[in-house]
Interface confidence: medium
């Protein structure tokens, strides 16, 4: 806050802005009468130098003229490009209490001279829209920059605007508020930028177009589409666009793709027919648009329109799979799977499925529909059946999927040989098997079939199944496949009439079980030791169990145990053994075995046998 | 197809040390039960010892407890039985077995066991 020039003034040769590089004089004089009071020449002239209001340096040591008690010209050189603030100040040496007083400043600009503007792109957004000019002003010159851009062309048509860059604001754009017409089509027109500052001026070469190279018309609006008679593969797509389009450009995408069709449209006049789109699926659509077949510039893409196209009847076959259960002598129990459609096949929202189940000699039919993806009914054990399912939309159903219903474990000879699932990773399981070796009748399929072993999980769940070509012998199952889980996996091979199935366990991960089983009771029979127990609680037996093991040693001894190893039955819960001495205590547990090791010990339990040694 | 072959027998003197070998192919799965046996002539066979490939329990027989040491090495896929303190009663064909199926399992008995190697005769002499 420099109080207005009282004391003094300060001057800069040559001049208060000077190129980078230059090196300036500054002088500061006391007005006459002015200095300190007593002693004239205990007056002391010293110049601050300041940037961005930070005291940087005092210039004491600059000085190049001294008038003592009057006037001191200082020199300063390098100074860095922008504005730099110089104050002088009066010091008066013979009183060492008071602060130096400000005389007067000044602020010198170091900058350069503007090069001259390249890259100038002038647009005409529309054809009612004004013509604006950007370009590239070169280096950053560190001064107040004027820009004038001037335009010449038919007619004697002379426009010009201006504009100003500083440390605050940027000029590299100019509308020229004009509006160059469609009768100009063929016409040339110029402009040029010219840049002036205080170290100099530059003028941009001349830039020459036609109203064809810089008007982009508007982007086309009012989208929207009409299927013809509720089609959902062909639409007409309709826009509104400006008068002098000539050429279109169309995209558009389902909403969950990541690629464009794109189609190119001549003379459209707002109107182009869509043939290939897929039925029931929410598709997004935009519109660009040209003036001129090979000259100007595309529009910007319009709005979306998004929209979803209508049904049509699904044209899918269905994944049908089914278990069979006798529930008495003369009655059994079908339970019908079948898969959702994907939404290619499906082509709308299904409604329902249409289920047959037949006997085929008596012609016996039960029918139903169902919402739901599952069906079960009662029927004689007696008769050849045959099922089949049709899923249905609004727009129709899809043609019925046959299955003969089979004993699908019944024919030992179509059983497939050497089952193994091995655990791929996290989420899947590798099952490969051999052919049956001596089937009767030609292997038309085979099904891999899998169910988590839990309790409940044949009732509460439907099982998963995959269809195996019959030339394949592996199959990498991963739907609901979980870490730490045990999955019964059966392979069934079927020919066209008969089913032969062999059955593995297996999981993708596998952990030591979390415990070892509960033994609930001991009991003596005929000699034997009849050791009973239940199962390790689903969750905590992470994986497969292969193995159940029975330990025992006598009371109080520090000998290491027996043990007895014993597959793992899920329908088995209990073991005799039979190695026990009589009238000796001993002390029983039991743990399980994953492929990962062995659990904990369950619960202790002690036993003494009083039978006779065996 | 598993496949056990036996090495290391010999003659000793009472009170001698020899260390017998099984190496093991075609066992594919982490933990398997493997054990030595031996079949003094004119006896039964009898378990001296055995170890779970998975964890690496042992058990042994109550005549050799203390003298013999069973362990493995599963990178080279061998079973050892390290004899100390050998008596002129330990003389024997000794037998390495696998269990490769499953079934009931007790800890010595030779019918625990389904794959069987040739046999390696072990003379002590006093």
């Known amino acids: 806050n420099i109080d207005v020039c009282k004391l003094g003034t300060v001057t800069v040769q040559p001049a208060p802005v000077i190129p980078l590089g230059s090196a300036a004089n500054i002088s500061c004089s006391l007005n006459p009468k002015q200095g300190c009071s007593h002693y004239p020449s205990s007056n002391e002239l010293i110049l601050l130098k300041f940037v961005n209001d930070v005291l940087v340096e005092n210039l004491h040591g600059k000085k190049v003229h001294d008038h003592t008690g009057h006037s001191s010209t200082f020199q300063v050189t390098n100074l860095s490009l922008g504005m730099t603030l110089f104050v002088c100040k009066l010091n008066c040496s013979n009183s060492q209490k008071k602060p130096p007083v400000p005389v007067c400043g000044v602020e010198i600009s170091v900058g350069v001279a503007p090069e001259p503007p390249q890259n100038i792109s002038c647009v005409q957004e529309g054809e009612n829209g004004t013509v604006a000019c950007s370009w590239n002003s070169g280096k950053v010159t560190y001064l107040k920059t004027n820009y004038t851009l001037q335009l010449s062309g038919p007619n004697n048509l002379t426009c010009q605007k201006q504009c100003f860059s500083d440390n605050r604001q940027n000029c590299n754009r100019l509308d020229l508020g004009i509006n160059l017409s469609p009768d100009l089509a063929e016409s040339r027109f110029i402009v040029r930028v010219t840049a002036i500052n205080d170290l100099g001026n530059s003028s941009s070469l001349p830039h020459t177009f036609t109203f064809l190279d810089i008007v982009i018309p508007l982007p086309p609006w009012d989208i929207r589409i009409n299927f013809l008679n509720a089609s959902g593969s062909r639409g007409t797509l309709q826009w509104e666009d400006e008068g002098q389009v000539v050429l279109n450009q169309l995209r558009y995408q389902p909403l969950n793709s990541t690629s464009w069709n794109m189609v190119n449209a001549t003379n459209a006049k707002g109107k182009y027919d869509l043939r290939d789109l897929r039925p029931f699926t929410e598709y997004e659509f935009q519109i660009s648009s040209k003036l001129h077949l090979s000259g100007g510039s595309w529009s910007n893409w319009s709005e979306s329109l998004r929209t979803r196209t209508p049904e049509e009847e699904p044209v899918g076959i269905l994944d049908i799979w089914y278990m069979k259960q006798d529930i008495d002598y003369d009655r059994q129990q079908i339970s019908l799977f079948w898969k959702s459609l994907n939404p290619s096949e499906a082509r709308g929202k299904i409604l329902h499925y249409q289920v047959t189940l037949q006997e085929v000699t008596k012609k016996t039919t039960l029918q139903n529909t169902t919402r739901h993806t599952s069906w079960t009914r009662v029927i004689p054990r007696t008769g050849a059946w045959t099922a089949s399912v049709s899923a249905a939309n609004s727009k129709g159903a899809s043609a019925p999927t046959h299955i003969n219903i089979v004993d699908l474990c019944g024919t030992g000879l179509l059983a497939p040989h050497q089952v193994s699932a091995k655990s791929e990773n996290m989420d899947n399981i590798l099952v490969t098997w051999q052919p049956p070796k001596k089937a009767d009748s030609a292997v038309r399929e085979y099904i891999v079939e899998w169910r988590a072993l839990q309790p409940g999980s044949i009732t509460k769940f439907p099982p998963h199944w995959l269809r195996i070509p019959p030339d394949n012998m592996s199959a990498l199952i991963s739907e609901n496949i979980k870490p730490y889980i045990c999955y019964e996996i059966r392979v069934h091979a079927l020919s066209e009439s008969q089913g032969g199935c062999s059955s593995i366990r297996g999981d993708s991960k596998h952990k030591a079980p979390v415990s070892g089983p509960h033994i609930t009771a001991i009991t003596e029979k005929k000699e034997r030791l009849f050791i009973s127990w239940t199962h390790i609680p689903f969750p905590e037996q992470r994986g497969c169990i292969l193995h159940y093991r029975i330990y025992w040693k006598e009371r109080d001894s520090t000998a290491q145990p027996e043990l007895c190893e014993i597959q793992y039955r899920r329908s088995q819960n209990s073991h005799p053994i039979s190695s026990l001495q009589p009238r000796v205590t001993y002390v029983l547990w039991m743990t399980a075995v994953t492929a990962a090791g062995e659990s904990p010990q369950g619960n202790e339990r002690e036993f003494c046998p009083q039978g006779k040694a065996n | 197809q598993v496949q056990l072959q036996e090495s290391g027998g010999g003659s000793v003197q009472a009170g001698g040390s020899l260390r017998l070998s099984c190496a093991a192919s075609?066992?594919?799965?982490?933990?398997?039960?493997m054990g030595w046996f031996r079949q003094a002539p004119g006896k039964e066979r009898e378990g001296v010892a055995t170890?779970?490939?998975?964890?690496?329990?042992?058990y042994y027989a109550d005549s050799v407890k203390g003298r013999f040491t069973i362990s493995q090495d599963n990178a080279k896929n061998t079973v050892y039985l390290q004899m100390n303190s050998l008596k002129p009663e330990d003389t024997a064909m000794y037998y390495c077995?696998?269990?490769?199926?499953?079934?009931?399992?007790?800890?010595?008995?030779?019918?625990?066991?389904?794959?069987w190697g040739q046999g390696t005769q072990v003379t002590v002499s006093s």
């Open positions: 077995a696998a269990r490769t199926v499953g079934g009931t399992f007790y800890t010595l008995a030779a019918d625990s066991f389904n794959t």
């Open positions: 170890i779970y490939t998975g964890s690496g329990h042992t």
């Open positions: 075609g066992i594919t799965y982490r933990g398997v039960w």
